[in-house]
Structures are given as structure tokens and as C-alpha cells.
């Protein structure tokens, strides 16, 4: 029951995380104009991974896509790549995890296969979450660097007579959405990996008390935790998917099917 709950919860959390990663990737507010030094501006600028927007006090908003590919900063391209990889891995992970859910029966799929699929999806979620966190963090670092560079060069002009206020950008809502979503996907992935350990059929004999009752045996591990049942009636496990993207590879020691807690 606990394994099913862990698997289901992991799926739901990952689903929410991946949805968040997709949302963050599509959002225009990755960076927003810093109004601290120019609170009286009637024009508000904000930028996303795919386009930049200007909102006027008049209520009109104009967005322009980045129609060039080669002319964009390498860092922006890298962030785009990380987020897309995160989304793709997360989506594949979700697909795999749906079939791995204990509550879903597909033909005569064995528990070992479900365990492997759960582990695979868990790893995918972890990598997906790391990709998202890395992507958002790279963008945030880029913003911080640019912010201080523009602060050092805040006002330019001829002889100090004419001032040109340089537009500075600070963290937009998408960054926070991305960090949270990446974290959720990561957590969901870890939960899936943990659930995998409980799903795998036991192959090693442990010192355990065996109770024989009416032709079907139930082995209990010390501590009263039900490790396996005869022909495995799968308890229902439901998971909702949470969108999440992972960033970068993570060294992960995966539980083997012999690793029982």
C-alpha cells in the first residue's frame, strides 16, 4: 500500500512539475524591467525565451519574437535547449510511468517490468528536473551579471546634460515557476525511484517468519512489513502528472531489486 501511494504521489508530483516546466518555458516573464531606479516609467519591458514584450501604460502590449537563431546569445540558446530537453524527458517519463503504475494492468506485465519502468521514469524525472533547474539558474546568473554591468554603466550621455537611463532587468515570474517546477519534478522522480524498490519481486531469502494458511503463503519481513504476496494482486495506485523538466545529468545510485529496506 505504501509503495503504491509513493508511486502514485511521485507520479502526481512529477506531473505538476512537468506542467510547471512547460508553463515556465512558454512564459514571457523570464526577465522583467527593474523599476527601482526608474519607478516613473510609462513603458514596461519584459522578456522570455522566445520573445520580448513591451507593455505601455495605455494598456497596449507588443511582443516580438526572436526570429533569428544565429544572432541570439549562446546562453539563451543553452537555456532553451535545457528546458526543451527537460520537457521531452519529463514527457517520456510520464508516458513510461503511466504504464508502470500498479493500478494499471497491461496484459501479463510482471512486477519486475513495472519496477524497471518505475525506475526508468524516476530517473527521467530526476534528469528532467535538473535540466529545468539548471536552465533557470543559468538564465538567472546571466541576469545578475548583466544587472551589475548595467548598474556600473547606469547613465550615459553627452557632458552629463542629456541622460539616457539604461534599462536593467531583474528576475521574472518564470524563473520562480521554473525553480519550483524543477524541484517538484526532481522530488517526484526520487519518489518513483523509492517506489521502484518496493515494487520489485523479492529474489533473496531473508530470515523471515513464514505463515502458511489455506494454500497461499504470505512472507513477512521482520517488522511486519508486507514485502510480497503470492501472485501479486496489484493494489490500486493512482497518480496525477505534474509537469517538470530536469536539468543536467545527475549521478544517481539506483536501487536494485535486491535492495529492500
Amino acid at each position: 500500500m505504501a509503495v503504491t501511494a509513493c508511486q502514485g504521489l511521485g507520479f502526481v508530483v512529477s506531473l505538476i512539475g512537468i506542467a510547471g516546466i512547460i508553463a515556465a518555458t512558454c512564459m514571457d516573464q523570464w526577465s522583467t524591467q527593474d523599476l527601482y531606479n526608474n519607478p516613473v516609467t510609462a513603458v514596461f519591458n519584459y522578456q522570455g525565451l522566445w520573445r520580448s514584450c513591451v507593455r505601455e501604460s495605455s494598456g497596449f502590449t507588443e511582443c516580438r519574437g526572436y526570429f533569428t537563431l544565429l544572432g541570439l546569445p549562446a546562453m539563451l540558446q543553452a537555456v532553451r535547449a535545457l528546458m526543451i530537453v527537460g520537457i521531452v524527458l519529463g514527457a517520456i517519463g510520464l508516458l513510461v510511468s503511466i504504464f508502470a503504475l500498479k493500478c494499471i494492468r497491461i496484459g501479463s506485465m510482471e512486477d519486475s517490468a513495472k519496477a524497471n519502468m518505475t525506475l526508468t521514469s524516476g530517473i527521467m524525472f530526476i534528469v528532467s528536473g535538473l535540466c529545468a533547474i539548471a536552465g533557470v539558474s543559468v538564465f538567472a546568473n546571466m541576469l545578475v551579471t548583466n544587472f551589475w554591468m548595467s548598474t556600473a554603466n547606469m547613465y550615459t550621455g553627452m557632458g552629463g546634460m542629456v541622460q539616457t537611463v539604461q534599462t536593467r532587468y531583474t528576475f521574472g515570474a518564470a524563473l520562480f515557476v521554473g525553480w519550483v517546477a524543477g524541484g517538484l519534478t526532481l522530488i517526484g522522480g526520487v519518489m518513483m525511484c523509492i517506489a521502484c524498490r518496493g515494487l520489485a519481486p523479492e529474489e533473496t531469502n531473508y530470515k523471515a517468519v513464514s505463515y502458511h494458511a489455506s494454500g497461499h503463503s504470505v512472507a513477512y519481513k521482520p517488522g511486519g512489513f508486507k514485502a510480497s504476496t503470492g501472485f501479486g494482486s496489484n493494489t490500486k495506485n493512482k497518480k496525477i502528472y505534474d509537469g517538470g523538466a530536469r536539468t543536467e545529468d545527475e549521478v544517481q545510485s539506483y536501487p536494485s531489486k535486491h535492495d529492500y529496506v
Partner: antibody, heavy 118, light 113 residues
Framework: QVQLQQSGAELVKPGASVKLSCKAS????????INWVRQRPEQGLEWIGW????????KYNEKFKGKATLTTDKSSSTAYMQISSLTSEDSAVYFC???????????WGQGTLVTVSA | DIVMTQSPSSLAVTAGEKVTMTCKSS????????????LTWYQQRPGQPPKLLLY???TRESGVPDRFTGSGSGTDFALTITSVQAEDLAVYYC?????????FGSGTKLEIK
């Protein structure tokens, strides 16, 4: 077509208040902000502030804070500006105008002449 | 506040002539986000409310004759009327639409000889 119809001329005493109206027609009133502009006799234009009927957000020129109060009535598609503690300095033509691209003002009202005199 | 300085304060031309008036702002009106200058030109004929001519420094409002042309960027702007007509007799104002408070120039009065 878009029209802004302003109330008639006002003759008021110093220290009194006056409420000017600007009735909009020909467009969705809640979609666009309404600006108010003052023009003193033989002088230039001064921006007083704007109000968005949709969400009620208001922005004032610091110079007119406490002097002008902007409100709207969505049911009648009318914007109002109340000017308080009137002095001879407030004698002017007051215009309302709809916000447009580039924060510009389009579709101006015909103006309301306010004369402050004892 | 941004100060808008218009020159000349008045000018008299004969019909058909080309006329240029300038507007200078104390701060740049160029927005880096969309590379547009938040400067507007208005025409105010005697006894009438102002009429929008150009926004974003050079974008002509619909219905405005193409003899009106806006130019400039940053802090220096100009309004050119290529062939002045009798109905162009008016005061022309430039306006800062970039930062609050929105400020107007003192105007350039165009007279027809």
C-alpha cells in the same frame, strides 16, 4: 465613431469644487484609459492624470495630487474629474482624451472651460 | 520631470513651402525593449482640442495627411510638413510619453503668410 463628450462651461467661486464629466461612446469604455489635460489661457498643455475604467487604476501627475480626483461610472461610460479648492490658477480648459498606442492621446473631448472668479 | 523644448516658438511660411520644427527632450525617450521613441506630435487649431498627428515619433495616425513626417531618436526630434496648406495653421505640440509625468513642449505656432 469614437467620441468624448464633455460637460459645459463652469463658473465657480474660489475655494469651491467642481466636477467635470466626459461621456465616451463608439468604443468599449472599460478597455481604454482616459487622460485629463489642462490648458490655461494662452498657455501650453499639462497632463493631470489617467484612469482605467476597467480596473479603476489611476495615475496622477504629482503636481495635481490632492487637487484633482479621477473617477468613472462604467454603467454610463462616463469619466469624471473633481477639482477641489479652486483658485484663479485653476481657470483653464480641461480636456479628456482616450489612451492610444505609444501612450499617446487620441479622440479628445471638446474641452470644458472652468472659470474661477469671486 | 522630462523637459520638452520646442523651437522655434513661432514661424510664418507661405502655402506650399516646406517647414520643419524641432523638439528636444532632457532625457532619452528611446525604449530599448522595442527600439521605439515615446514621443507624440499634436496639432491644435484655434478653438479646437489637440489632434493626434504622430506617435512613436514617426508613426502617422490614420487620416493624417502624408505631408506630415516625424523623425529623430533619443532626445532630438523633428516634425516636417512638406507642403504647408492653409488648414495647417495651428500650434504644434510634442509630448513625452515615456516617463511620468507626461510632459508637453511649449508649442510651435505655425502661421501662414
Amino acid at each position: 465613431q469614437v467620441q468624448l463628450q464633455q460637460s459645459g462651461a463652469e463658473l465657480v467661486k474660489p475655494g469651491a469644487s467642481v466636477k467635470l464629466s466626459c461621456k465616451a461612446s463608439g468604443y468599449t469604455f472599460t478597455t481604454f484609459g482616459i487622460n485629463w489635460v489642462r490648458q490655461r489661457p494662452e498657455q501650453g498643455l499639462e497632463w493631470i492624470g489617467w484612469i482605467f475604467p476597467g480596473d479603476g487604476s489611476i495615475k496622477y501627475n504629482e503636481k495635481f495630487k490632492g487637487k484633482a480626483t479621477l473617477t468613472t461610472d462604467k454603467s454610463s461610460s462616463t469619466a469624471y474629474m473633481q477639482i477641489s479648492s479652486l483658485t484663479s490658477e485653476d481657470s483653464a480648459v480641461y480636456f479628456c482624451a482616450r489612451f492610444y498606442y505609444g501612450n499617446s492621446f487620441v479622440s479628445w473631448g471638446q474641452g470644458t472651460l472652468v472659470t474661477v472668479s469671486a | 520631470d522630462i523637459v520638452m523644448t520646442q523651437s522655434p516658438s513661432s514661424l510664418a511660411v507661405t502655402a506650399g513651402e516646406k517647414v520643419t520644427m524641432t523638439c528636444k527632450s532632457s532625457q532619452s525617450l528611446l525604449n530599448s525593449g522595442n527600439q521605439k521613441n515615446y514621443l507624440t506630435w499634436y496639432q491644435q487649431r484655434p478653438g479646437q482640442p489637440p489632434k493626434l498627428l504622430l506617435y512613436w515619433a514617426s508613426t502617422r495616425e490614420s487620416g493624417v495627411p502624408d505631408r506630415f513626417t516625424g523623425s529623430g531618436s533619443g532626445t532630438d526630434f523633428a516634425l516636417t510638413i512638406t507642403s504647408v496648406q492653409a488648414e495647417d495653421l495651428a500650434v504644434y505640440y510634442c509630448q513625452n510619453d515615456y516617463t511620468y509625468p507626461f510632459t508637453f513642449g511649449s508649442g510651435t505656432k505655425l502661421e501662414i503668410k
